[in-house]
Amino acid sequence: EKSDLRTVAPASSLNVRFDSRTMNLSWDCQENTTFSKCFLTDKKNRVVEPRLSNNECSCTFREICLHEGVTFEVHVNTSQRGFQQKLLYPNSGREGTAAQNFSCFIYNADLMNCTWARGPTAPRDVQYFLYIRNSKRRREIRCPYYIQDSGTHVGCHLDNLSGLTSRNYFLVNGTSREIGIQFFDSLLDTKKIERFNPPSNVTVRCNTTHCLVRWKQPRTYQKLSYLDFQYQLDVHRKNTQPGTENLLINVSGDLENRYNFPSSEPRAKHSVKIRAADVRILNWSSWSEAIEFGSDDG
């Protein structure tokens, strides 16, 4: 188990226990209970109070990070007396040994890389392990392929994201023969960590007066539909003076992605490239390959 649990309790204890795998806090049921509540307080004095489970002798915390250390508290009243018990959940191990600079990104719609750095005070034999649990906590994913630096795990590559949901809990545990290693945990939204591919199937068709650009929305890990996308088109006249402004056009996603613009013959050589983003986050993809149209003698 990743941390010491210390109980602060009066003589007759509720025997409060916490399972970090399921994020479930439980205690001994008391006869004739009239009131019970559980909550945690973090290092910034923020309080999180989840709903009690049906049996009223446990509660499950949904979206919490524990690496800064928290204190759980249970209050129970019975028809005879009141009980209160605190459970300290520190992040035991030497300060500064936990993995740091942790980040993940999803790319190519179904791949994910997570990276981290070794803690500044971590010993040379430190080894880190990544575990991921989805918001439904139905299954735990262990890192299948570690990225290593001098034998130490400093990243993870996943090529199967089927176990993820929209919000996921990431835990990096550490081990060493020398000292205790602190853990690091984080909650990440897949929406916020996905890097889109550029739009595909970009085509340009011109008639005597106009050019029509068409493209397909990128394949994404998240289930997105056409209104969730924003596009930017860079229509660029070739062989212009350096410093000439490119024409950047913003286009909202549509069922049929297209942009029609006036361009009469004879037309000079142009290029067009497109990038995509989530309309709410505007985390732009890289640009698509430039498509050329028009002629050198236009």
Epitope: K191, Q222, K223, L224, S225, Y226, L227, D228, L255, R280
Partner: antibody
Amino acid sequence: QVQLVQSGAEVKKPEASVKVSCKIPGHSLSELSIHWVRQTPTKGFEWMGGFDPEENEIVYAQRFQGRVTMTEDTSIDTAYLTLSSLRSDDTAVYYCAIVGSFSPITYGLWGKGTMVTVSS
Amino acid sequence: QAVLTQPSSVSGVPGQRVTISCTGSGSNIGAPYDVSWYQQLPGTAPKLLIYHNNKRPSGVPDRFSASKSGTSASLAITGLQADDEADYYCQSYDSSLSGSVFGGGTKVTVL
């Protein structure tokens, strides 16, 4: 211009079933998600169900659970709504709609609607 | 009874600005879930006007704008025109009902 083509009006007796179709010409149903919504003068719009990406399956509104089935035939790009054990208060215009956004569900394009009348 | 509450009607003269309110609760608009707005002309299917609280699909004129605050949202139509005469509906998601919810609709009359 993309259009959703719905089947024609139906008149049904109480306790019967009705099946409404919704075709998307020129578009692959496998790349789109369809939801069904009905409209009555008294209750207004009522969401009936549709594809939920988080569950990766079709989900139904609680009040229609057990009476409604939504199916798709991707080979002909057609979605179907079947409502059974019809009652007079199921008389409504039934719309299929393409999901334009999933967060939360937004209906980007609606079919013209299918009038279903339940009368003895 | 609609989950989201809208005024049953509003009216204005051509060129005027009218607003329509949509009030929800902590399980829908205040959760917070985004709001969409639809226009339904007499005898036709609804048409999407606004999504993600304030974004317009291509082809919707910028006379239509919307905003959201807390558990309420509003749609504004500036430079009111005769062909804006229609029913307008707000829509969001409700976590307690696990599905889409709609307002009862507002009839806009151009005097």
